[in-house]
């Protein structure tokens, strides 16, 4: 590794990768091993970030970028740049401080992580429930009563259906 | 665990030089820098200088360019301060500390207890 | 060289209280300071670097701040263990220098 000074700041001709080392007379120096500068003219590399425990490597650290950690299966990334690990729950579940728990009727979670949201009130928008919701789902809205006099049709029909093989024109 | 053992004291006479040790463990002695610093009862802290194991490389303040010398011996990872000519401004506590090479900050992550050190006849 | 001032060195305070000590470079140090807590018994140990960053093993009651020339050591829920003497030391060029100490007595 080519070790350089320059005539002006010394530090400033320090690429990405190295150091300017105070103490060698302000050269610049390649980052000791698990340590990384990813912008020019630093006195100090940076500790990579070590993913240990809950958290797996997604990117491995190298002299110009800092390692990126995801979690291990069961659990899912917090905050920026996964600072944290939450657990998984099913759908249909809320992580407490007990652990998993099934969502209170009423409400659903549709998804491994986050809180159970209540269902959607259908009659604040006029409307009325077509399909109930679960733990998993939320409720279906479908037309207001109003709207289902008789001979209407509350399902929207099918759009015609295309021959395998075909294309549009 | 890091430590840096040092001695608990040391007299010395006048003229008479003397040499502090700072022997480590815990760690890979040859990756971090070894510091030396002067504490003088009820004052502050001067850096002395400090040598990188590996390969013997040192620095100094100029303020104590002619009263120290750093060395180190790899095979007892023990770090070495020669103090020349001795008066009675050279009476305080010397420590050892390290810090590793190229990052942190430069700053000293873990520090000996101290050699006191006292000048008289 | 250098230098490193701290204005302040000694401060009463009671357990519980919020404690801010300075330091101040004669000239910007990029944020290369260091602060050092020294017990009565001499043990010296590392508290922060690199104005912010914690070191391993240090509670989160002791934090750093500040920039260019000026910096301070934040202790926000004072404990008796805390009473000790607090260096700050600059890292950006040799050579290495520190505040003169702020000494942290308890009411």
């Known amino acids: 590794f080519e070790r350089t000074r320059s005539l002006q700041d010394p530090c400033s001709n320090c690429p990405a990768g190295t150091f300017c080392d105070n103490n060698r007379n302000q050269i610049c120096s390649p980052c000791p091993p698990n340590s990384f500068s990813s912008a020019g003219g630093q006195r100090t590399c940076d500790i990579c970030r070590q993913c240990k425990g809950v958290f797996r490597t997604r990117k491995e650290c190298s002299s110009t970028s800092n390692a990126e950690c995801d979690c291990t299966p069961g659990f899912h990334c917090l905050g920026a740049g996964c600072s944290m690990c939450e657990q998984d729950c099913k759908q249909g579940q809320e992580l407490t401080k007990k652990g998993c728990k099934d969502c209170c009727f009423g409400t659903f979670n549709d998804q491994k992580r986050g809180i159970c949201r209540p269902w959607t009130n259908c009659s604040l928008d006029g409307k009325s429930v077509l399909v109930n919701g679960t733990k998993e789902r939320d409720v279906v809205c479908g037309p207001s009563p109003a709207d289902l006099s008789p001979g209407a049709s509350s399902v929207t029909p099918p759009a015609p259906a295309r021959e395998p093989g075909h294309s549009p024109q | 665990q890091v430590q840096l053992q040092q001695p608990g004291a040391e007299l010395v006479r006048p003229g008479a030089s003397v040499k502090l040790s700072c022997k480590a463990s815990g760690y890979t002695f040859t990756s971090y820098w070894i510091n030396w610093v002067k504490q003088r009862p009820g004052q502050g802290l001067e850096w002395i200088g400090n040598i990188y194991p590996s390969d013997s490389y040192t620095n100094y303040n100029q303020k104590f360019k002619d009263k120290a010398t750093l060395t180190v011996d790899k095979s007892s990872s023990t770090a070495y301060m020669q103090l020349s000519s001795p008066t009675s401004e050279d009476s305080a506590v010397y420590l050892c500390?390290?810090?590793?090479?190229?990052?942190?900050?430069?700053?000293?992550?873990?520090w000996g207890q101290g050699t006191s050190v006292t000048v008289s006849s | 060289d250098i230098q490193m001032t701290q204005t302040t060195s000694s401060l009463s305070a009671s357990l519980g209280d919020r404690v801010t000590i300075s330091c101040r470079a004669s000239?910007?140090?990029?944020?290369?300071l260091n602060w050092y807590q020294q017990k009565p018994d001499g043990t010296v140990k590392l508290l922060i670097y690199y104005t912010s960053r914690l070191h391993s093993g240090v509670p989160s009651r002791f934090s750093g701040s500040g920039s260019g020339t000026d910096y301070s050591l934040t202790i926000s829920n004072l404990e008796q263990e805390d009473i000790a003497t607090y260096f700050c030391q600059q890292g950006y060029t040799l050579p290495y220098t520190f505040g003169g100490g702020t000494k942290l007595e308890i009411k």
């Open positions: 000239q910007d140090i990029s944020n290369y």
């Open positions: 500390t390290r810090f590793p090479d190229g990052y942190y900050s430069y700053a000293m992550d873990y």
